[in-house]
């Protein structure tokens, strides 16, 4: 049951996150002009990835397209291309934890398969959720230093008659949007990557296996685990990682596929 | 058609006050800024007052601040000007005006004239 | 406050005659946003209120006659009337439309000989 309720929490929080993601890279407000310590202005502008706005104070907002590919700084399509892969993964991370969801029969699907696709999706939503975050820092960082250059030569003047004031951008509400979003895909993706190990059938745990020799037995632990030899109490160990009380001699009456690696 | 007709205008003893109206037609009124401007006798053309479509955005001349106050009844169409304290300075045209593309003023009224004399 | 400078104050031609009013800007007008310059010109006749010419600087607003004609960038601007004609006897405003509070020229008065 908390299984089932991590796994779809992480897809309800994923789904969030990605929603987040695609609002935050089609917003306009990614950079808003300054208006801290600036004469106030009749005209606000603000830019997106994909346009940039000017609000006038009449009312009327006229948006231009970033109608260039070539011309645009390198960062900006490094930040497009990072939202946009954020996206394409997220939205198949979501297309696969559909499927996985413990709550959705489809056929004869196995919990194996179910967990390895929760596993899937989860790492999807971690990358997506990576992918955001890192676009909208690198926005950020690259605002950060055009404000701080732009505040450097704030006035350019010609021959010190005519002062022009240069247009500063802070950070716009995308940005916020985006980090946030990005946060939701991540920890999404982490519910999903715990509800996996709850939803692996207990076979897919690692468990002890049991070679029998002649004279005695010794179980073998994976992982680099200290061998424990057959004789008296040491052949109830408890196996490592599973949520139930079996003993490796209840293990081996149980075979599988899964028992031998 | 676009229309803009001011009223409230008259004489007015220093420091009293008065209440200028410009009733607007023909467009959306609340989706424009709009603007009060004033010309005293036989001077220029003098800005007083802006107010946004939404009323969230006012902003005023100097000499006025404190003293006017912009103000805009959407579902009336009507746009205000509260005026107190008046000066002799304060004489003069008073045109309302609808800001449009390029935050110029592209239609104006025909004026409601304040004289502040004693 | 921005201070907007026009000159000359007075004009006097002949109808037919071109005719250049200039209008300086304290500061640049331009936004780097659109790369726009908001700057308007205004004429009024006398006993009327202004009418809009000229928006952005260069943008002839819709039923102006093309004889008019707004041109510069940044702080300096003209008005341009190709061939003056008795009905453009009016007083010339320029207008700063980019910073509150929106400030006018002094006005160029055209007449006509």
């Known amino acids: 049951m908390a299984v089932t309720a991590c796994q779809g929490l992480g897809f309800v929080v994923s789904l969030i996150g990605i929603a987040g993601i695609i609002a935050a890279t089609c917003m306009d407000q990614w950079s808003t002009q300054d208006l801290y310590n600036n004469p106030v202005t009749a005209v606000f502008n603000y830019q997106g990835l994909w346009r940039s706005c000017v609000r006038e104070s009449s009312g009327f907002t006229e948006c231009r397209g970033y109608f260039t590919l070539l011309g645009l700084p390198a960062m900006l399509q490094a930040v497009r291309a990072l939202m946009i892969v954020g996206i394409v993964l997220g939205a198949i991370g979501l297309l696969v934890s559909i499927f996985a969801l413990k709550c959705i029969r489809i056929g004869s699907m196995e919990d194996s398969a179910k967990a390895n696709m929760t596993l899937t999706s989860g790492i999807m939503f971690i990358v997506s959720g990576l992918c955001a975050i890192a676009g909208v820092s690198v926005f950020a960082n690259m605002l950060v230093t055009n404000f701080w250059m732009s505040t450097a030569n704030m006035y350019t003047g010609m021959g010190g008659m005519v002062q022009t004031v240069q247009t500063r951008y802070t950070f716009g509400a995308a940005l916020f949007v985006g980090w946030v979003a990005g946060g939701l895909t991540l920890i999404g993706g982490v519910m999903m990557c715990i509800a996996c190990r709850g939803l692996a059938p207990e076979e897919t745990n690692y468990k002890a296996v049991s070679y029998h020799a002649s004279g005695h037995s010794v179980a073998y632990k994976p992982g680099g685990f200290k061998a424990s030899t057959g004789f008296g109490s040491n052949t109830k160990n408890k196996k490592i990682y599973d949520g139930g009380a079996r003993t490796e001699d209840e293990v081996q009456s149980y075979p599988s596929k899964h028992d031998y690696v | 058609d676009v229309q803009l007709v001011e009223s409230g205008g008259g004489l007015v003893q220093p420091g009293g006050s008065r209440k200028l109206s410009c009733t607007a037609s023909?467009?959306?009124?609340?989706?424009?800024?709009m603007n009060w401007v004033r010309q005293a006798p036989e001077k220029g053309l003098e800005w007083v007052a802006f107010i946004s479509g939404g009323s969230n955005t006012i902003h005023y001349l100097d000499t006025v601040k404190g003293r006017f106050t912009i103000s805009r009844d959407n579902p009336k169409n009507t746009l205000f000007l509260q005026m107190t304290s008046l000066r002799s300075e304060d004489t003069a045209m008073y045109y309302c005006?609808?800001?449009?593309?390029?935050?110029?003023?592209?239609?104006w009224g025909q004026g409601t004239s304040v004289i502040v004399s004693s | 406050d921005i201070v907007m400078t026009q000159s000359p104050s007075s004009l006097t031609v002949t109808a037919g005659e071109k005719v250049t009013m200039s209008c300086k800007s304290s500061q640049s007008l331009l936004n780097s946003g659109n790369q726009k310059n908001y700057l308007t010109w205004y004429q009024q006749k006398p006993g009327q209120p202004p009418k809009l010419l000229i928006y952005w600087a260069s943008t002839r607003e819709s039923g102006v006659p093309d004889r008019f004609t707004g041109s510069g960038s940044g702080t300096y601007f003209t008005l341009t009337i190709s061939s003056v004609q008795a009905a453009d006897l009016a007083v010339y405003y320029c207008?700063?439309?980019?910073?509150?509070?929106?400030?006018f020229g002094s006005g160029t008065k055209l007449e006509i000989k």
């Open positions: 005006t609808r800001l449009a593309l390029g935050n110029a003023m592209d239609y």
């Open positions: 207008q700063n439309d980019y910073y509150f509070p929106f400030t």
């Open positions: 023909g467009f959306t009124f609340n989706s424009f800024g």
